[in-house]
């Protein structure tokens, strides 16, 4: 790992993996075990990142990168590089301080995690409610009533299937 | 546990030399800087050499670079500093240390220290 | 050589208070800054490494802050086992140096 001197700064050239060791008279050394260096001219190799207990490891570290994290099953990842792991809840669901909490009525929540958000208000933009909300679902908004006057053309739903072998009564 | 254990205090004449060691355990002796500090009554600390032990790569302070030696024997995970031409001034508490991560450059575990003391 | 100089070179303070200690290098030493308590007959020990970074095992309330050639040594709240001399080192350039000290005493 030794490297030519740099005029400038003696640790310039010492690659990613390795320091410049002051030890050593600024040669460049590896970075030791669970450490590394992203880039070159460092005097220094951070520590390996440690994916425990709730985190579990995605990417190992090596003398160039930093190990990445995610979460165990039941868990998603929060902030930046997956800072923290926070516990999955079920679709219609929320996480509170409390545990895992049902959405109130008029609220929906389709993911594991975030929090339960009102149904969209279709009158707002001037439409109906085509399908009604769930704590899983959102409202479907269907055509605006006007959309729906005499010599409109509107969409209606398909007649219901008849059983075979069946007449109507 | 981490553990540097020094040898006893020494009482020497002026231009005879002192060999103080230093027992390691409970880490990968070869794995980490061995360095030497003094300390003179009611005075500072002030850094004298440091040794690998893997490769016996030292850097010695200019300041004692003619009298001072250190040594390890990886065998027994011991280091050694020797120091000659004592005189009166070189009256200190002679600590090892280990240096932690290689490039912090921090003092992390230390020995109890062995008195030297330079008297005619 | 690089100089360390500490003050103030003594200190008097009383149980709680907040203790600040400051280390200047004569040089830019990047964050290569080390803190150390050495208590009567005892050898130093590390409580801050790297500026910032507290070393393993060591209270909360003992804090580093700083970069290049100013640097500064807190503790929060003052407990009667503080009592000791603390020591500044810098880590960038062979020779490794020492600060003189700030010893701290009880009000």
């Known amino acids: 790992f030794e490297r030519t001197r740099s005029l400038q700064d003696p640790c310039s050239n010492c690659p990613a993996g390795t320091f410049c060791d002051n030890n050593r008279n600024q040669i460049c050394s590896p970075c030791p075990p669970n450490s590394f260096s992203s880039a070159g001219g460092q005097r220094t190799c951070d520590i390996c990142r440690q994916c425990k207990g709730v985190f579990r490891t995605r990417k190992e570290c090596s003398s160039t990168s930093n190990a990445e994290c995610d979460c165990t099953p039941g868990f998603h990842c929060l902030g930046a590089g997956c800072s923290m792991c926070e516990q999955d809840c079920k679709q219609g669901q929320e996480l509170t301080k409390k545990g895992c909490k049902d959405c109130c009525f008029g609220t929906f929540n389709d993911q594991k995690r975030g929090i339960c958000r009102p149904w969209t208000n279709c009158s707002l933009d001037g439409k109906s409610v085509l399908v009604n909300g769930t704590k899983e679902r959102d409202v479907v908004c269907g055509p605006s009533p006007a959309d729906l006057s005499p010599g409109a053309s509107s969409v209606t739903p398909p007649a219901p299937a008849r059983e075979p072998g069946h007449s109507p009564q | 546990q981490v553990q540097l254990v020094q040898s006893g205090a020494e009482v020497k004449k002026p231009g005879s030399s002192v060999k103080v060691s230093c027992k390691a355990s409970?880490?990968?002796?070869?794995?980490?800087?061995i360095n030497w500090v003094r300390q003179a009554p009611g005075q500072g600390l002030e850094w004298m050499g440091n040794?690998?032990?893997?490769?016996?790569?030292?850097n010695y302070n200019q300041k004692f670079k003619d009298r001072v030696t250190i040594t390890a024997d990886k065998s027994t995970s011991t280091a050694y500093m020797e120091l000659s031409s004592l005189r009166s001034e070189d009256t200190a508490v002679y600590y090892c240390?280990?240096?932690?991560?290689?490039?912090?450059?921090?003092?992390?575990?230390w020995g109890q220290g062995t008195l030297v003391t330079v008297s005619s | 050589d690089i100089q360390m100089t500490q003050s103030p070179s003594s200190l008097s303070a009383s149980v709680g208070d907040r203790v600040t200690i400051t280390c200047r290098a004569s040089?830019?030493?990047?964050?290569?800054l080390n803190w150390y308590q050495q208590k009567p007959g005892k050898a130093p020990k590390l409580l801050i490494y790297y500026t910032s970074r507290l070393h393993s095992g060591v209270p909360s309330r003992f804090s580093g802050s700083g970069s290049g050639t100013d640097f500064t040594f807190t503790i929060s709240s003052l407990q009667p086992e503080d009592i000791a001399t603390y020591y500044c080192?810098?880590?960038?350039?062979?020779?490794?140096?020492f600060g003189p000290g700030t010893k701290l005493e009880i009000k």
């Open positions: 040089q830019d030493i990047s964050n290569y």
């Open positions: 040794i690998y032990p893997s490769d016996t790569y030292t």
């Open positions: 080192q810098q880590g960038h350039t062979l020779p490794y140096t």
């Open positions: 409970g880490y990968t002796f070869t794995s980490y800087w």
């Open positions: 240390a280990r240096m932690g991560d290689p490039f912090y450059y921090a003092v992390d575990y």
